[in-house]
Interface confidence: medium
């Protein structure tokens, strides 16, 4: 979380954003708010990103401002025109690129004053691992399959009988470029399993950190995955 | 198009003001800082400060404190530098500079100001 | 103040081939967030500077990728993979972690 005031004491408004994540040919949220002004006409939102010339969005007078908008971010960005109000100024980022990343300001400038505040964004692929008994292996053997990954994650498999144990002599991982050449499919095999434990699949890059659990028991298998994005801090 | 454009050349005696104007296009002025930038011929570069140009407060330099002014006119998107009590090495190009984050990343043309008798 | 020195002074170069320029400052350029304020410029002649690359290693927009920067604390590289015409001018390094923000005394490239 990263808090801003105005640099200016008498007119300085706090603004917070937190840091996040995009995923690559999805919609991504930059998250900004401020203290609500109570005439739309009065708020200002700029937002701006570091290594660029152009506005990434503007917004005044209740409505979009994008005369000064840079080309690589025509047409895919547009802010909450109805949270405004409330003091909500994020921005949608549609089609997330690889090249998003980096730092952005959010600018804010209501009749109380001004302030702004700085968001990392980073930008890649993360997907939720599935694990799965691999029946047509000669063994007793797991496959954790996730079909989106950028950049290169590591792939880690533990076990919840054997806490502590390396995996990494009994388990094989590879990574297959996708069609679009960017994001790559992991998949990892682990070898060897035993019955009535419970095997974990973290796969983890400096964006996400996923996990695929698979319980094998002799009367059942069951199967949880989750995702965490690893960078949302506030500021 | 983001640009700035600077005033011309000026020609001072010893001991008299110069003022200097940026005038910014292509962006929400009070957006970013506004620098300027001292160039000596055949000389490096020396910050001389710069100016809040949403508050209008200035930082200068230490070597500059004193004898700078710079002020700004958000009506005209235009940024001044005044520098007073003038001496020949003063003799140098001055450059407008947008601060994005922490780097300068427009600059002006530069303005050549020559101090001479 | 941070003195920033530059070295060399003056590099001929040939067409298509590399070169590097290297930067110092008399105290570490890490800033208590982490970030490290150095960033490079170039001056053609008879032209304003402009930002090449900043934060140490990141480049400008438009700026072409046989530019790259390196370092850490006081110590830092700015490298042209294979130089063309129009890299010919005055390179500065410059930094912004500490006010003043100082630059070097610049490197004049030059064709052979």
């Known amino acids: 979380l990263i808090i801003g005031f105005g640099i200016s004491g008498r007119h300085s408004i706090t603004v917070t954003t937190v840091a996040s994540a995009g995923n690559i040919g999805e919609d991504g949220i930059l998250s900004c708010t401020f203290e609500p002004d109570i005439k739309l006409s009065d708020i200002v939102i700029q937002w701006l990103k570091e290594g660029v010339i152009g506005l990434v969005h503007e917004f005044k007078e209740g409505k979009d401002e994008l005369s000064e908008q840079d080309e690589m971010f025509r047409g895919r960005t547009a802010v909450f025109a109805d949270q405004v109000i409330v003091g909500n100024a994020s921005l949608r980022l549609k089609n997330v690129q690889l090249t998003d990343a980096g730092t952005y300001k959010c600018y804010i400038i209501t009749s109380k004053g001004k302030g702004n505040a700085n968001l990392e964004y980073k930008t890649g692929a993360f997907s939720m691992p599935e694990v799965n008994v691999d029946y047509n292996a000669s063994s007793e053997t797991l496959r954790c399959e996730a079909p989106r990954w950028f950049p290169q994650p590591t792939v880690v498999w533990a076990s919840q009988v054997d806490q502590g144990a390396n995996f990494s002599e009994v388990s094989n991982t590879s990574f297959e470029l996708n069609s679009e050449n960017v994001t790559m499919k992991v998949v990892s095999v682990l070898y060897n399993v035993t019955i009535n434990n419970t095997y974990s699949c973290m796969i983890e890059n400096d964006i996400a950190k996923a996990t695929g659990d698979i319980k094998v028991t002799e009367s059942e298998i069951k199967r949880r995955s989750h995702l965490q994005l690893l960078n949302s801090k506030a500021s | 198009q983001v640009q700035l454009v600077q005033s011309g050349a000026e020609v001072k005696k010893p001991g008299a003001s110069v003022k200097v104007s940026c005038k910014a296009s292509g962006y929400p002025f009070t957006t970013y800082g506004m620098n300027w930038v001292k160039q000596a011929p055949g000389q490096g570069l020396e910050w001389m400060g710069w100016?809040?140009?949403?508050?209008?407060?200035?930082t200068y330099a230490d070597d500059f404190k004193g004898r700078v002014t710079m002020t700004r006119d958000t009506s005209i998107s235009t940024a001044y530098m005044e520098l007073s009590r003038l001496r020949s090495d003063d003799t140098a190009v001055y450059f407008c500079?947008?601060?994005?984050?922490?780097?300068?990343?427009?600059w002006g043309a530069g303005t050549t100001v020559t101090v001479s008798s | 103040d941070v003195v920033m020195t530059q070295s060399p002074l003056s590099l001929p170069v040939t067409l298509g081939q590399p070169a590097s320029i290297s930067c110092r400052s008399s105290?570490?350029?890490?800033?208590?967030?982490?970030?490290?304020?150095l960033h490079w410029y170039l001056q053609r002649p008879g032209q304003s500077p402009r930002l090449l690359i900043y934060k140490v290693s990141n480049r400008f927009s438009g700026v072409p990728d046989r530019f790259s920067g390196s370092g850490s604390g006081t110590d830092f590289t700015l490298k042209i993979s294979r130089v063309e015409a129009e890299d010919v001018g005055v390179y500065f390094c410059?930094?912004?972690?500490?006010?003043?923000?100082?630059f070097g005394g610049g490197t004049k490239v030059e064709i052979k």
């Open positions: 100016i809040d140009t949403y508050s209008g407060v200035p």
């Open positions: 105290q570490s350029l890490v800033h208590s967030n982490a970030n490290t304020y």
């Open positions: 500079a947008r601060r994005s984050f922490w780097y300068f990343d427009v």
């Open positions: 410059s930094q912004s972690t500490h006010v003043p923000w100082t």
